[in-house]
Amino acid sequence: SPVPPSTALKELIEELVNITQNQKAPLCNGSMVWSINLTAGVYCAALESLINVSGCSAIEKTQRMLNGFCPHKVSAGQFSSLRVRDTKIEVAQFVKDLLVHLKKLFREGQFN
């Protein structure tokens, strides 16, 4: 049976917590990704940004999980209007910002 949205969001948060906890060396060798507006469509926007990071095993599970939240197919190089224009940040900061936002969504009961 399908996982309830609240459980899926909690599992994604858990994975991001694991990443922040276990981060010793710079995450993904300090790779930079496009910053996004943390608004509607956050899952697809986050995936569109993170999918451009390759060869980083630490975020592969996150990429797969975000894929489950995003209703459309996302491929590298694609980007929606949710990108913050010409602003790139380190993956570690991106993950932290995303974690803060998702925890707030969970607290507010916004699971989809």
């Epitope: 609240s6 909690k10 917590v17 922040t20 932290k96 803060v100 925890k103 607290r107 699971f111």
Partner: antibody
Framework: QVQLVQSGAEVKKPGSSVKVSCKAS????????MHWVRQAPGQGLEWMGT????????KYVPKFQGRVTITADESTSTAYMELSSLRSEDTAVYYC??????????????????WGQGTLVTVSS | DIQMTQSPSSLSASVGDRVTITCRSS???????????LEWYQQKPGKAPKLLIY???DRFSGVPSRFSGSGSGTDFTLTISSLQPEDFATYYC?????????FGQGTKLEIK
């Protein structure tokens, strides 16, 4: 260290407005919710509303809806509570408080863990 | 709105006593995400409130182990296992599960 410093006491006339500020330090307000709670003399605590400074989303108690406006300025790490059409019953100490997430827990408390010192607003003709 | 009713409204006790304060909500306060955001705050005259307990039973950092919380659904308790002189104060329960969030009317704990 974490601190919330509120603006000073105010004396206001009935029908006027008051704007109380709450300056945060030691954390990023965009990572938090900022709340306002008031306490009339000799009375209990009353939650008024909250803001998510990351996006400006607010929630208010219906009895204050239309009279209260909570805002936050991320650039100055300051939250504000403005109350209009003041009446004598609004005489109270107004507190700001924050609730924040923690990097290392999945299920956060988001309870009001740090509070400002309080601002006494007196409404009198 | 959800009403939070505390009992007793005031209570006289001695140092070393075990004290229990109860809080009843007018309806179930389980959040849509499965958590119950029931908190307890302590307030001393002329001071801001202090967080003691969150999510029914989790003790906030720095809070002595003599403070404990329990309950479920609509009935909750704060227990102080052995009263200390600094514990004489007013205690408030609070629900943060359903907007508008609401406090109980308070329980004043006085020295006998």
């Amino acid at each position: 260290q974490v601190q919330l410093v509120q603006s000073g006491a105010e004396v206001k006339k009935p029908g006027s407005s008051v704007k109380v500020s709450c300056k945060a330090s030691g954390f990023y307000i965009k990572d938090t919710y900022m709340h306002w709670v008031r306490q009339a003399p000799g009375q209990g605590l009353e939650w008024m509303g909250t803001i998510d400074p990351a996006n400006g989303n607010t929630k208010y108690v219906p009895k204050f809806q239309g009279r209260v406006t909570i805002t936050a300025d991320e650039s100055t790490s300051t939250a504000y509570m403005e109350l209009s059409s003041l009446r004598s019953e609004d005489t109270a100490v107004y507190y700001c408080a924050r609730s924040i997430y923690d990097d290392y827990h999945v299920d956060d408390y988001y309870a009001m863990d740090y509070w400002g010192q309080g601002t006494l607003v007196t409404v009198s003709s | 709105d959800i009403q939070m009713t505390q009992s007793p409204s005031s209570l006289s006790a001695s140092v070393g006593d075990r004290v229990t304060i109860t809080c009843r909500s007018s309806q179930n306060i389980v959040h849509i995400n499965g958590n119950t955001y029931l908190e307890w705050y302590q307030q001393k005259p002329g001071k801001a409130p202090k967080l003691l307990i969150y999510k029914i039973s989790d003790r906030f950092s720095g809070v002595p182990s003599r403070f404990s919380g329990s309950g479920s659904g609509t009935d909750f308790t704060l227990t102080i296992s052995s009263l200390q002189p600094e514990d004489f104060a007013t205690y408030y329960c609070f629900q943060g599960s359903h907007v508008p969030w609401t406090f109980g009317q308070g329980t004043k704990l006085e020295i006998k």
